[in-house]
């Protein structure tokens, strides 16, 4: 498949197909045209196409300008304005306002609680397998191997703070080396991404939301991404973060410091220790070869347990093995030496809802696993709606202005260094890039923020949750001190090159740009966002892992030519796109290769047919939850259920009827069903201004 | 109460062998390490080995590997030592005494049996 | 093999008074040593043990000191039942070893 799909014999025009998935650039609505639309009335739909620059060809319908989908949404408010009200009106309209910050609030504490617990439903279901992956030997000779592990446990366990945890004791156990734990550090980055992608998939109701959030968030993971691609091979070749972070923890007498507060714990904790408490140690004991820990249950039932160091008598092969020669002696029989051990009495159980099943830790986890996302997609869908219903008009115009508007010139440049410092201190704040990042998505989605200034947010979450793991380290205790410190410091280092790579000069934002390429993919195809989440986070990590065990001949003989075969495609789109005629014209697009190998069209049709039958039944079912969601959200006329089942209305009742569509650019067509139009609600009662 | 009951004495011919016995009673027989200790006046006392009547695993002191052989009867919550090819400096008073595992004191001790070699 | 020497094969005391038996290891035994008392036609009897610890029953004015190689038996206020055999017994090793005894006499 050619990295742009639905090219066809199109040649893309660098300024226009830069951005696009597959070179095109669908038209957003405008939104201000579409608040007098009821349930009942359908706009009629016009079908653009564009053409390749070089092209003579017209359209009869051709508009004056075609919208940017990238362009934030223009949200209208359409209640009666603070002036026109009464009295009693205004009253009320001030306890909606204060009704609905609480719910806001309500509902971002419910999401931030099911964050916590789908990463302990994570490590139920896959913290055992990745203790397991950290006992591999090969680590320590294999840096890609020691990158996909950080990958893969950080995502089975939904936490980077663990997987780095279970790294820095196993170099303070001397199991691993700084050198070794440095790939696995830049690994738990990338896996930490993929949170706020699933975040993300909760948007996929609405396309155009849908475009900027996945957007928004797998901005992250290309960050993460292309920073390993280029790092990883200069840090093998160099060691620059060894030696750097070697220097800096030589060169100061550090004194264990106090543990970073726990400023978003503190409120969430007395929830989410209701639901479930783990003995997050296990994981470690695995990755520390323990085999006496894999038999244990992740789930904590006992809280409170009281420890009596004591000693006893333990037999020895001969005296030279005993503990200390003072204490040595026999029995006639059998030497013997005195032994420190703790002795663990369990005094009270801990209070969860899971204490007493005594349920397998893949059960529970299943169980969290399908409970937190739901809860996830509920308070998700509640925060989306309850900001839509706020963020209107004034409101909107003012943090919209305010979050994405630059300094005046010539400070402009300066913005996007205060946005990074932003997020460093709201991640430092909440203590965890995955809920700062989880949280920026539906703000992203909804078009209050733009992926331009959630960009240097989410780089800025990066520096942030090295902050947390620096202040981490230095309260380690003493024989901990020194390797936590030092591999809190690569983490910050590779972040700190990562931002110097891919941010200050506007041309090497790649991230930004790739990830409006998904974004856009992903709009047309909702099932590649899916697609992508699973080839990224675990077929790649799983494939490597799998090959550097196979050894390292197999490693390099799979891998080279795959590399050899992505940098090909990569030149030659390059050149496709920046100067076609050095190229033969065969190569001039990507016509000669079958069309399952360069669209996605063909794969389009087969997930289809297997979503197809499924989506018929969840509509019906998803009709009523949304029929309860509209009445609370005070909409009544907005019940068209979800946009899965409104594509599918559509196709049924056959609306799509293109004003011109030229076989030969049929496949960059560009339909309603590309824009993700979502009729806005007339309701005469809104209010937005507090 | 703990009780080790030892034959008193016992008359032997050089060259011969004797089979001594300890009666253990008070006790669980199996838990605990039994001694064998010899007592000359010359000599003073000396540490024959011992027997761990739960596992039957036997530790001796070296000059009494070839002479002494330390068995036990868990039925009859008896130890027996054996001495074999006796002479004159085998004579003297052999005690049979308790240890608890991990404890090289002897606690309890039997009233000794009077080995006499003589022809 | 550890040898365990009691210098004093006799010592002579009054009753009432205070007396101390030594013993010497040759070797590092640390802690482990035992001191017992045979009477006349009786078997040992358990004093100490782990050098310092008087065994259930003993009169306090037994006691025990040293570590390493040198061992001390102290009787504070000898009384005529006292009159006995003293042995040290190390258990720091296999085989364990005894020492040769001091004779307690009664003046």
């Known amino acids: 498949m050619a990295p742009w799909p639905e090219l066809g014999d199109a040649q893309p025009n660098p300024d226009k197909y830069l951005e696009g998935a597959a070179g095109q650039q669908p038209t957003a609505p405008d939104k201000s045209k579409e608040t007098n639309k009821t349930d009942n009335t359908e706009a009629p739909v016009t079908k653009i196409e564009l053409l390749p620059s070089y092209s003579t060809a017209t359209l009869i319908d051709e508009p004056t300008e075609v919208d940017d989908p990238w362009n934030l949404p223009t949200l209208q408010d359409s209640g009666i304005k603070w002036s026109e009200r009464d009295t009693k009106g205004k009253i009320l309209c001030f306890f909606q306002g204060i009704g609905r910050l609480i719910l806001l609030l309500g509902f971002l504490y419910f999401f931030v609680c099911s964050l916590d617990i789908l990463s302990s439903a994570f490590q139920l279901v896959g913290g055992k397998m990745a203790g397991q992956f950290f006992s591999n030997s090969s680590i320590m000779s294999n840096p890609l191997l020691g990158l996909v592990i950080g990958v893969l446990v950080t995502v089975l366990v939904q936490s980077s703070s663990t997987s780095t945890s279970i790294v820095v004791s196993m170099v303070s156990s001397s199991l691993l080396t700084v050198r070794a734990a440095i790939p696995i550090i830049m690994g738990a980055n990338i896996g930490t991404s993929i949170t706020n992608t699933i975040v993300a998939l909760m948007q996929v109701g609405d396309r155009s939301e849908f475009r900027r959030a996945f957007a928004g968030a797998t901005v992250h993971d290309f960050f993460n991404w292309l920073s390993v691609l280029v790092l990883l091979p200069v840090e093998v070749a160099t060691h620059y973060l060894e030696i750097i972070t070697q220097l800096i923890v030589e060169s100061f007498h550090f004194k264990n410091g106090e543990d970073a507060p726990d400023l978003l714990k503190v409120i969430t904790k007395p929830f989410t220790k209701l639901i479930v408490q783990l003995d997050k140690k296990v994981i470690s004991q695995i990755a520390m070869n323990d085999e006496k820990a894999k038999n244990k249950s992740l789930v904590k039932i006992w809280c409170k347990t009281f420890t009596n160091k004591t000693q006893i008598n333990v037999t020895v092969p001969s005296t030279a093995n005993c503990t200390s020669p003072s204490l040595c002696w026999t029995d006639g029989i059998q030497n013997w030496t005195m032994k420190n051990v703790t002795y663990k009495e369990n005094i009270a159980k801990c209070q969860h809802i899971f204490v007493n099943f005594h349920l397998p830790d893949l059960a529970v986890g299943t169980i969290l696993l399908i409970l937190s996302l739901l809860v996830l997609c509920g308070c998700l869908i509640m925060i989306v709606k309850i900001l839509g219903s706020v963020l209107k008009g004034q409101v909107a115009t003012v943090i919209k202005k305010t979050i994405n508007t630059d300094f005046p010139f010539p400070f402009a440049w300066l913005t996007g260094y205060l946005a990074i410092l932003v997020g460093a201190g709201m991640t430092f704040i909440v203590q965890s890039s995955s809920v700062f990042t989880s949280a920026l998505t539906p703000l992203i989605g909804i078009g209050v923020i733009t992926i331009e200034r959630a960009y240097p947010l989410t780089l800025g979450s990066n520096i942030g949750t090295t902050t947390t793991a620096i202040l981490a380290a230095l309260a380690s205790p003493g024989n901990a001190l020194r390797s936590s410190l030092q591999i809190a410091l690569c983490h910050f280092f590779f972040n700190i090159s990562g931002i110097l790579l891919w941010y200050p000069i506007p041309f090497t934002r790649l991230p930004i740009r790739m990830a409006k390429g998904l974004g856009n993919i992903s709009a047309k195809y909702r099932w590649f966002a899916v697609f992508y989440l699973i080839i990224f986070f675990f077929l790649i990590p799983l494939t490597v892992f799998g090959l550097s065990l196979a050894g390292w001949r197999v490693l390099v003989g799979v891998g080279v030519p795959v590399v050899f075969i992505i940098i090909l495609v990569l030149c030659l789109r390059l050149l496709q796109s920046r100067c076609p005629r050095v190229l033969p014209k065969k190569l001039q697009n990507w016509n000669f290769l079958p069309l399952w190998m360069r669209s996605l069209k063909p794969w389009d049709a087969v997930v289809s047919k297997f979503t197809g039958c499924f989506q018929m039944r969840c509509c019906c079912c998803c009709r009523v939850c949304c029929r309860a969601c509209c009445l609370l959200c005070d909409c009544p006329k907005c019940c068209r259920c979800s946009k899965c089942c409104e594509d599918l209305e559509e196709a049924q009742e056959g609306q799509d009827v293109p004003v011109k569509a030229p076989e030969t650019f049929d496949n960059i067509t560009i339909s309603r069903e590309a824009q993700g139009e979502v009729p806005a609600s007339d309701s005469k009662t809104e209010c937005t201004a507090l | 109460q703990v009780q080790l009951q030892q034959p008193g004495a016992e008359l032997v011919k050089p060259g011969a062998s004797v089979k001594m016995s300890c009666k253990a009673s008070?006790?669980?027989?199996?838990?605990?390490?039994m001694q064998w200790v010899k007592q000359t006046y010359g000599q003073g006392l000396e540490w024959i080995g011992a027997?761990?009547?739960?596992?039957?695993?036997?530790s001796y002191n070296q000059n009494f590997k070839v002479k002494a052989t330390l068995t036990a009867d868990k039925i009859s919550s008896t130890a027996y030592m054996q001495l074999s090819s006796l002479t004159s400096e085998d004579s003297a008073v052999y005690y049979c005494a308790r240890a608890a595992r991990a404890e090289g004191w002897f606690a309890y001790w039997g009233q000794g049996t009077l080995v006499t070699v003589s022809a | 093999d550890i040898v365990m020497t009691q210098s004093h094969k006799f010592m002579s005391t009054s009753v009432g008074d205070r007396v101390s038996i030594t013993c010497k290891a040759s070797q590092d035994v640390g802690h482990a040593v035992v001191w017992y008392q045979q009477k006349p036609g009786q078997f040992p009897k358990l004093l100490i043990y782990?050098?310092?610890t008087r065994h259930a029953g003993v009169p306090d004015r037994f006691t025990g000191s040293g570590s390493g190689t040198d061992f001390t038996l102290t009787i504070s206020n000898v009384q005529s039942e006292d009159l006995a055999d003293y042995f040290c017994q190390q258990f720091r090793s296999i085989p364990l070893t005894f020492g040769s005894g001091t004779k307690l006499e009664i003046k």
């Open positions: 782990w050098a310092s």
């Open positions: 008070g006790y669980t027989f199996t838990s605990y390490n």
């Open positions: 027997i761990s009547p739960g596992s039957g695993e036997t």
